[in-house]
């Protein structure tokens, strides 16, 4: 029979072209891509492959070794001169490892029939590949009808005698896929029908989408689907110290490529992304939320000595409101307002000042006015009370001026203008205010209310009274108006610097009406209500000291 090389050599001995071919093949052995998982690679099997040839004089194994003395498993057949060839080569059982679609990569050489003398009628340039699924590792048989044909394999490049002479080896690589597979494993079979072939390597593999970390989500090794157009949706799991709003998913294509990412993971508060992992924020740095990209330095006047901080601690005497974001500097209450001036207009006071030198680092500075009424003699002050009105308001003032109205006249007041901000209520420290002392102008006094009768005689009446409740200044004198009852048009006026008088020249047993008013530098107040007193009869004893209600 014709040998593969077209030259005759001893039986079972590898012809020259095989040696040349194998040397070339060995130099080009490449590692499989990361998305391919080998189920069988004849090049890497160290011992016997355990394949069966049927009939025995068909396919034959050529025993060669590489430079490391590892066996090279090559099968050849070249019965081109004989008719009706039906030579089978069966692999051992191959586990599919859960894959439902597998790939078979064949590396082989094929002799050009035209380059062979004679045998043109019987020489073929193709061979067939079959498979048979089985759960049983010992289920190998050679019932041809049980094997399912995968394809007829033809060479893209066939070689001639001339190629041998030039030492040019034309190694063909053909890949076919099979699926869907439903059993644990399968056998492959190669059928020769009269070609001159050397099967240099058989690699069976499935494709997977290799485990990957994308957007801080770990996607596991995923075996591709059975359908060549199928996309498998795969859920990812967030890496340590990361969280997600939208669970991460990706799609594994039939080619073993990850496509169409959905969702992502984010490093949780206190951690930041570095090299695809979530690293702890170191002391002095913080991250308040997963949605923030990286750890940031503590803002001014704050610190953290912890790892994985989500906020920083305010320094002594500095504060943070609950509503302040953790990225905002810690702040403190403002210093006192400055350069306060007052302007008194009768019973109104206008105050003006300039803002504090130190706002405490905040923009929400406002002012509060505390009003105190002071007794100039005792030096004691008390709250002003509710009768005072503040324009525009007493607290929460944004402008640096305020007007107080409805004050008491001729009264000493102390106004405390306090600067406050958003953290003033958090600070245990002393209030920061500037004081202004003012005295309101004098005004006409209020009416005299409390009048007592003194000695009453037949021709005179003695009266005493108390200063008005609101003198509104220094009482310069009192004016007493009196007349006989029902004789209002004929009245008498007496002036007194004291709070007592005696009206004389009165008729006995007559009723007299008295009204009293006080005067300050601002003028007279209104007269008091009418007080009625009666002189005694001619012969009666005089009365004394009874109070008129």
């Amino acid at each position: 029979p014709a040998s593969l090389a077209g030259c005759y050599s001893a039986p079972r001995r590898a012809p020259l072209w095989t040696c040349l071919l194998l040397c070339a093949a060995l130099r080009t052995l490449l590692a499989s891509p990361s998305n391919e998982v080998n189920l069988l690679d004849s090049r890497t099997v160290m011992g016997d492959l355990g394949w069966i040839a049927f009939p025995k004089n068909g396919w034959e194994e050529i025993g060669e070794v590489d430079e490391n003395y590892a066996p090279i498993h090559t099968y050849q057949v070249c019965k081109v001169m004989e008719q009706n060839q039906n030579n089978w080569l069966l692999t051992s059982w191959i586990s599919n490892e859960g894959a439902s679609r597998i790939f078979i990569e064949l590396k082989f050489t094929l002799r050009d029939c035209n380059s062979l003398p004679g045998g043109l009628g019987t020489c073929k340039e193709t061979f067939n590949m079959y498979y048979f699924e089985s759960d049983d590792q010992n289920g190998r048989n050679i019932k041809e009808n049980q094997y399912i044909k995968i394809d007829t394999i033809a060479a893209d490049e066939s070689f001639t005698e001339l190629d041998l002479g030039d030492r040019v080896m034309k190694l063909n690589t053909e890949v076919r896929d099979v699926g869907p597979l439903s059993k644990k494993g399968f056998y492959l079979a190669f059928q020769d029908v009269g070609a001159c072939i050397a099967l240099v390597s058989v690699r069976v593999y499935y494709k997977k989408c290799p485990s990957v970390v994308r957007h801080l989500a770990v996607f596991p090794d995923t075996i591709t689907g059975a359908d060549s157009s199928q996309l498998l949706e795969v859920s990812g799991s967030c890496v340590n110290h990361s969280v997600t709003d939208e669970p991460p998913k990706m799609h594994c294509s039939a080619e073993g490529e990850w496509l169409v990412p959905i969702g992502k993971c984010m490093c949780k508060a206190g951690y930041e992304e570095k090299n695809g992992t979530c690293q702890v924020c170191r002391p002095g740095f913080f991250k308040a939320s997963p949605h923030i990209q990286s750890c940031g330095k503590c803002p001014p006047h704050s610190y953290t000595h912890e790892e994985a901080s989500t906020s920083c601690v305010c320094e002594k005497d500095y504060f943070r409101r609950e509503s302040d974001p953790p990225t905002m500097a810690c702040t403190r209450p403002p210093s006192a307002p400055r350069n306060a001036i007052s302007n008194v207009n009768e019973t109104s006071v206008f105050l003006e000042w300039i803002p504090p030198a130190d706002t405490g680092g905040r923009k929400d500075v406002s002012y509060y006015i505390a009003c105190k009424k002071c007794n100039s003699h005792a030096g004691v002050c008390e709250e002003c009370g509710g009768h005072v009105r503040y324009l525009p308001r007493q607290s929460g003032l944004k402008n640096t001026s305020v007007m107080m109205v409805d004050l008491l006249a001729h009264t000493n007041y102390t106004f405390e203008i306090e600067a406050v901000n958003g953290v003033s209520d958090l600070s245990p420290g002393a209030r920061q205010y500037v004081s202004v002392n003012v005295t309101t102008n004098q005004a006409a006094p209020s009416p005299v209310t409390n009048v007592k009768k003194g000695k009453i005689a037949k021709n005179s009446i003695s009266l005493s009274w108390q200063e008005p409740d609101r003198p509104n200044g220094i009482i310069l004198e009192y004016e007493i108006k009196y007349f006989e009852k029902d004789q209002e048009t004929s009245y008498t006026i007496i002036k007194s610097k004291e709070t007592t008088i005696t009206a004389e020249g009165l008729k006995p047993a007559s009723v007299y009406v008295f009204q009293i008013r006080a005067r300050t530098a601002a003028g007279y107040g209104v007269f008091s209500r009418r007080f009625e007193f009666e002189t005694t009869p001619v012969f009666a004893a005089s009365s004394d000291q009874s109070q008129i209600p």
Epitope: R282, P283, G284, Y303, H305, E306, E307, A308
Partner: antibody, heavy 120, light 111 residues
Framework: EVQLVESGGGLVQPGGSLKLSCAAS????????IHWVRQAPGKGLEWVAS????????YYADSVKGRFTISRDNSKNTLYLQMNSLRAEDTAVYYC?????????????WGQGTLVTVSS | DIVMTQSPDSLAVSLGERATINCKAS??????????MNWYQQKPGKAPKLLIY???NLESGIPDRFSGSGSGTDFTLTISRLEPEDAAVYYC?????????FGQGTKLEIK
């Protein structure tokens, strides 16, 4: 006023144990990292251990790892250093020091130190 | 561990003169644009005192004749006009990574 006061030092035999304390006052103890630093007689400073305010982060020098334990009781404003399997080379003045608040932090307040002598 | 090496081991400088102490780290002590380098002063029988933090920041209450400079692995402490009370041992310390290592110290004497 910030104050750190160490106590618990003394003479101990090799292989023995000792527990140092550091009483803190004048600051919010629970928010501050505190360190132990030691100084052998006539030698330089050697950092020993540190603990964060919430005790979540603890570090030791290789020379004391497995033998010394740093801890704190924030309710008592006190830091501790439990020293076991003491060796002659552990003889030193032990200082506690507060991690500062100005970034990047240094050790801004130190105690007066307590002397530990390991000798037979 | 990061090894801190100070130079010189000791120096004597006249009053009013400038004193310079160097510190070299076996690897960079910088992180995110800041240098984690501190300088301390220690007088006999006393606890160390922080002078400079973050390579160049003067600690509160320290006279401004003290200054620090440098980044990465090379740092310098400078005392611009030496005063009698500046006689002490000076230590550099890195706080970039655990363990926080100190230099061996430099003894400064008044000439």
């Amino acid at each position: 006023e910030v104050q750190l006061v160490e106590s618990g030092g003394g003479l101990v035999q090799p292989g023995g144990s000792l527990k140092l304390s550091c009483a803190a006052s004048g600051f919010t103890f629970s928010t501050f990292g505190i360190h132990w630093v030691r100084q052998a007689p006539g030698k330089g400073l050697e950092w020993v251990a540190s603990i964060s305010g919430a005790s979540t982060t603890i570090y030791y020098a290789d020379s004391v790892k497995g033998r010394f334990t740093i801890s704190r009781d924030n309710s008592k404003n006190t830091l501790y250093l439990q020293m076991n399997s003491l060796r002659a080379e552990d003889t030193a003045v032990y200082y506690c020091a507060r991690y500062g608040t100005s970034f990047p932090y240094g050790l801004d307040y130190w105690g007066q130190g307590t002397l530990v002598t390991v000798s037979s | 561990d990061i090894v801190m090496t100070q130079s010189p081991d000791s120096l004597a400088v006249s009053l009013g003169e400038r004193a310079t102490i160097n510190c070299k780290a076996s690897q960079s002590v910088d992180y995110d644009g800041d240098s984690y380098m501190n300088w301390y002063q220690q007088k006999p029988g006393k606890a160390p005192k922080l002078l400079i933090y973050g390579a160049s920041n003067l600690e509160s209450g320290i006279p401004d004749r003290f200054s620090g400079s440098g980044s990465g692995t090379d740092f310098t402490l400078t005392i611009s006009r030496l005063e009698p009370e500046d006689a002490a041992v000076y230590y550099c310390q890195q706080s970039n990574e655990d363990p926080f290592t100190f230099g061996q110290g430099t003894k400064l004497e008044i000439k």
